[in-house]
C-alpha cells in the first residue's frame, strides 16, 4: 500500500541566464528512500543513490548542480529549459512515487514561483 | 573510441582472493557508472554490483555483499573488482561495463572483453 | 530484488522465418508518471561480451538492424526478429534498468532450425 505524497514546487518560472532549484518532499510514509532520479520527458538529468551518490547524466554536466539535499539545482537557463521535470523517488518497500513540476523560463526579469501541489 | 580493457585470465584456489582491473579509455572515467557482471559457464548474466567513479560509492547485489569489492582509481582511469573467500562456483567470465544515459535511461553501452577466474584446488 | 523470467530457454526458427522472445517481471517496470518503461534487450554471440539491442523496451540502438523490434509495458515484454538471419544466433537477454539491482533474465538460445 503507498500511502506517500510528494510535494513539488508545482509551477515555477525563472528568467533566462538564471538558475532554479528544483525540489520534492516525499511525507506521509515511513518508506525507506532508496533512489531519486530527476528526469524530463525524454531524459535523465541525474540520479542521487543512497550507496553511490549524486550522478549527473554527462550531457548536463555542465550546467546542472547537486542539492541542495534530494534537489536539483539547473543553472544557465535558456527558453529551451521550458517544461516538465519530474522527481521519481524510489522507495522500499513502498515502490515508486512521482512528482511533476512545469518550469517556464522568461526572457523578461518577471519570474514568480506557482503554488505547492501534491501528488499521490 | 571508448574502450574498456580488462586484466587477463587467473587460476586461484579455493579461499584465495582475485583483484581484476578495467581500464577505461576514450571517454571522462568520472563521469560514467561502472558496472560488474559475472557469467558461469554455459550460465546467463548476473549483476554484481556498480561504483560512481565521481564519488567513490558503490552499490553490490546482496549476494556479493561482503565477499565483492569495487573500487576505482582516478588518476589512471582504472576499475577494479576484488573477491574474496573464492569457491568453485566463482568460476565465471567477469565483465565491466560502462552505464551510459539513454534518454530516461541508464544502459550498459560499452563492455569489457571479459576476465576468466577460474578457481581450482 | 525484481525477478526477470524469459520464455523460451531456447528457440530454434528457420532462416527467414519470425522468432519471438518473451520477457516476465515480478514488478511493473512502467513508470506511469512518465509513461516509460525501464526494460533492455541484449544479445550476447559465443565469446562475446553482450551488445544493445534495445532500451525503454521498444526504442532500437542506433546500428541495430530494423528486423529487431521490442514491445510490451508493465510486466510483459517481447523482443521480435521479423526475419531471422544467421548472424542473428545468439543468446538474447532481458534486463530491468528500472531500479538497482539491475536483473538479468536467464537467457533463450536463438538457433537454425
Known amino acids: 500500500m503507498m500511502t506517500g505524497t510528494i510535494e513539488t514546487t508545482g509551477n515555477i518560472s525563472a528568467e533566462k541566464g538564471g538558475s532554479i532549484i528544483l525540489q520534492c518532499h516525499l511525507s506521509s510514509t515511513t518508506a525507506q528512500v532508496t533512489q531519486v532520479n530527476w528526469e524530463q520527458q525524454d531524459q535523465l538529468l541525474a540520479i542521487c543513490n543512497a550507496d553511490l551518490g549524486w550522478h549527473i547524466s554527462p550531457s548536463f554536466k555542465d550546467r546542472v548542480a547537486p542539492g541542495p539535499g534530494l534537489g536539483l539545482t539547473l543553472q544557465s537557463l535558456t527558453v529551451n529549459d521550458t517544461g516538465e521535470y519530474f522527481c521519481i523517488y524510489h522507495t522500499y518497500p513502498d515502490g515508486t512515487y512521482t512528482g511533476r513540476i512545469f518550469l517556464e523560463v522568461l526572457e523578461s526579469s518577471v519570474a514568480e514561483h506557482g503554488a505547492r501541489f501534491q501528488i499521490p | 573510441q571508448v574502450q574498456l580493457q580488462q586484466s587477463g585470465a587467473e587460476v586461484k584456489k579455493p579461499g584465495a582472493s582475485v583483484k581484476v582491473s578495467c581500464k577505461a579509455s576514450g571517454y571522462a572515467f568520472t563521469n560514467y557508472l561502472i558496472e560488474w557482471v559475472k557469467q558461469a559457464p554455459g550460465q546467463g548474466l548476473e549483476w554484481i554490483g556498480v561504483i560512481n567513479p565521481g564519488s567513490g560509492g558503490s552499490k553490490y547485489n546482496e549476494k556479493f555483499k561482503g565477499r565483492a569489492t569495487i573500487t576505482a582509481d582516478k588518476s589512471t582511469s582504472t576499475a577494479y573488482m576484488e573477491l574474496s573467500s573464492l569457491r568453485s562456483e566463482d568460476t565465471a567470465v567477469y565483465f565491466c561495463a560502462r552505464t551510459g544515459v539513454y534518454g530516461n535511461f541508464l544502459i550498459f553501452d560499452y563492455w569489457g572483453q571479459g576476465t576468466t577466474v577460474t578457481v581450482s584446488s | 530484488d525484481i525477478v526477470m523470467t524469459q520464455s523460451p530457454d531456447s528457440l530454434a526458427v528457420s532462416l527467414g522465418e519470425r522468432a519471438t522472445i518473451n520477457c516476465k517481471s515480478s514488478?511493473?517496470?512502467?513508470?506511469?508518471?512518465?509513461?516509460?518503461?525501464?526494460l533492455a534487450w541484449y544479445q550476447q554471440k559465443p565469446g562475446q561480451p553482450p551488445k544493445l539491442l534495445i532500451y525503454g523496451a521498444s526504442t532500437r540502438e542506433s546500428g541495430v538492424p530494423d528486423r529487431f523490434s521490442g514491445s510490451g509495458s508493465g510486466t510483459d515484454f517481447t523482443l521480435t526478429i521479423s526475419s531471422l538471419q544467421a548472424e542473428d544466433v545468439a543468446v538474447y537477454y532481458c534486463q530491468n534498468d528500472h531500479r538497482y539491482p539491475f536483473t538479468f533474465g536467464g537467457g533463450t538460445k536463438l538457433e537454425i532450425k
Open positions: 514488478q511493473s517496470l512502467l513508470n506511469s508518471g512518465i509513461q516509460k518503461n525501464y
